[in-house]
Interface confidence: low
């Protein structure tokens, strides 16, 4: 299993990972929306985006990982596994992983998955924008 780094990645490395994550995230979201027609725009989950202890924009891998582990059984496992693999690189060793539970109700579960995918895509765009506009 990949060992989480004990240091922060350079912005250039973070950008590379985000560029890997972006098409996977976008594809998952588009596919889910097309298959689950009629689901409302969702604010069901509040996906943490940035690490609070870094001056540079840095995705909070430790906080986001459990959401993807939670939605994995009802999503495209192959793509989710690749997202988890990339998020693991962004995980800081000191940061513990929280437990995230899927809602029991089927409709709520769908909303939860949609929210995670929407918010993660938005998070990636936000961080990428910050990295592109900031000093390198």
């Amino acid at each position: 299993s990949h060992m989480a780094p004990t240091h922060r990645l350079q912005p250039s490395d973070v950008r590379k990972i985000i560029l890997e994550l972006r098409p996977m995230s976008k594809g998952l979201l588009q596919d889910y929306v097309s298959k689950e027609i009629g689901l409302p725009e969702s604010n069901h989950s509040s996906l943490p985006c940035l690490s609070s202890d870094s001056q540079l924009p840095h995705i909070n891998g430790s906080a986001i990982l459990p959401y993807f582990r939670a939605i994995r059984p009802l999503s495209d496992k192959n793509t989710i596994d690749k997202i988890i693999e990339q998020l693991d690189k962004l995980k800081f060793q000191r940061e513990p992983e929280a437990e995230v539970s899927m809602p029991a109700d089927n409709f709520e579960r769908k909303n939860f998955i949609l929210a995670v995918l929407q918010q993660f895509s938005a998070c990636l765009e936000h961080v990428l924008q910050s990295l592109n506009s900031g000093p390198q």
Partner: antibody, heavy 118, light 111 residues
Framework: DVQLVESGGDLVKPGGSLRLTCSVT????????WNWVRQAPGKGLQWVAY???????DYADSVKGRFTISRDNAKNTLYLQLNNLKAEDTATYYC????????????WGQGTLVTVSS | EIQMTQSPSSLSASPGDRVTISCRAS??????????MHWYQQKPGQSPKLLIY???NLESGVPSRFSGSGSGTDFTLTISSLEPEDAATYYC?????????FGGGTKLEIK
């Protein structure tokens, strides 16, 4: 209605190469999953490979490193490149769509026969 | 990889008979109330055709005499009243995890 039409099957010698084509109408290959499944003469079905809407690919262990699945979005066409062919690759190769959000193969092509023999 | 075991490998039955085919997975294919198990029919010289998806859902256009049941590792395809055109080989398949795997098939012959 969704239609899948395979072509490219042929008689090839061991160690040889072949490219199979699956032309899709009625659905976009940039949505869902698109698979190759094979069936040796008189035998059962074996999943070979898939390419997902986001371009993610996966392969059966028996073909990893020898077969490559790809697509041409503009032509709405899938391909399976078969290299270093072995006698045990002799089979009818079917193209199939995974529907129901990646749950089951709901549309299949008619198949194309690949024969590997010296 | 998940191994799929179908039984019987072949059977012979008469029109009007009730027929059951079993499929056992080497591990559970259930998650969040879904069973990722499907059934296909393949007639001689034809492509496979989806009959049942997610254990018990009848695919559009499939006659209602076909039904599926089961969860976890044990699943059954039932034909309530056999018709001559049901002569075919039937396969179960799991999509719970990669690689997606099929059962060995059950060849159904009509007497």
């Amino acid at each position: 209605d969704v239609q899948l039409v395979e072509s490219g099957g042929d008689l090839v010698k061991p160690g040889g190469s072949l490219r199979l084509t699956c032309s899709v109408t009625g659905d976009s290959i940039t949505s869902g999953y698109w698979n190759w499944v094979r069936q040796a003469p008189g035998k059962g079905l074996q999943w070979v490979a898939y390419i997902s809407y986001s371009g993610i690919t996966d392969y059966a262990d028996s073909v990893k490193g020898r077969f490559t699945i790809s697509r041409d979005n503009a032509k709405n066409t899938l391909y399976l490149q078969l290299n270093n062919l072995k006698a045990e690759d002799t089979a009818t190769y079917y193209c199939a769509r995974y529907g129901n959000y990646g749950y089951a193969m709901d549309y299949w092509g008619q198949g194309t026969l690949v024969t590997v023999s010296s | 990889e998940i191994q799929m075991t179908q039984s019987p490998s072949s059977l012979s039955a008469s029109p009007g008979d009730r027929v059951t085919i079993s499929c056992r997975a080497s591990e559970s294919v259930d998650t969040y109330g879904n069973s990722f198990m499907h059934w296909y029919q393949q007639k001689p010289g034809q492509s496979p055709k989806l009959l049942i998806y997610r254990a018990s859902n009848l695919e559009s256009g499939v006659p209602s005499r076909f039904s599926g049941s089961g969860s976890g590792t044990d699943f059954t395809l039932t034909i309530s009243s056999l018709e001559p055109e049901d002569a075919a080989t039937y396969y179960c398949q799991q999509s719970y995890e990669d690689p997606w795997t099929f059962g060995g098939g059950t060849k159904l012959e009509i007497k």
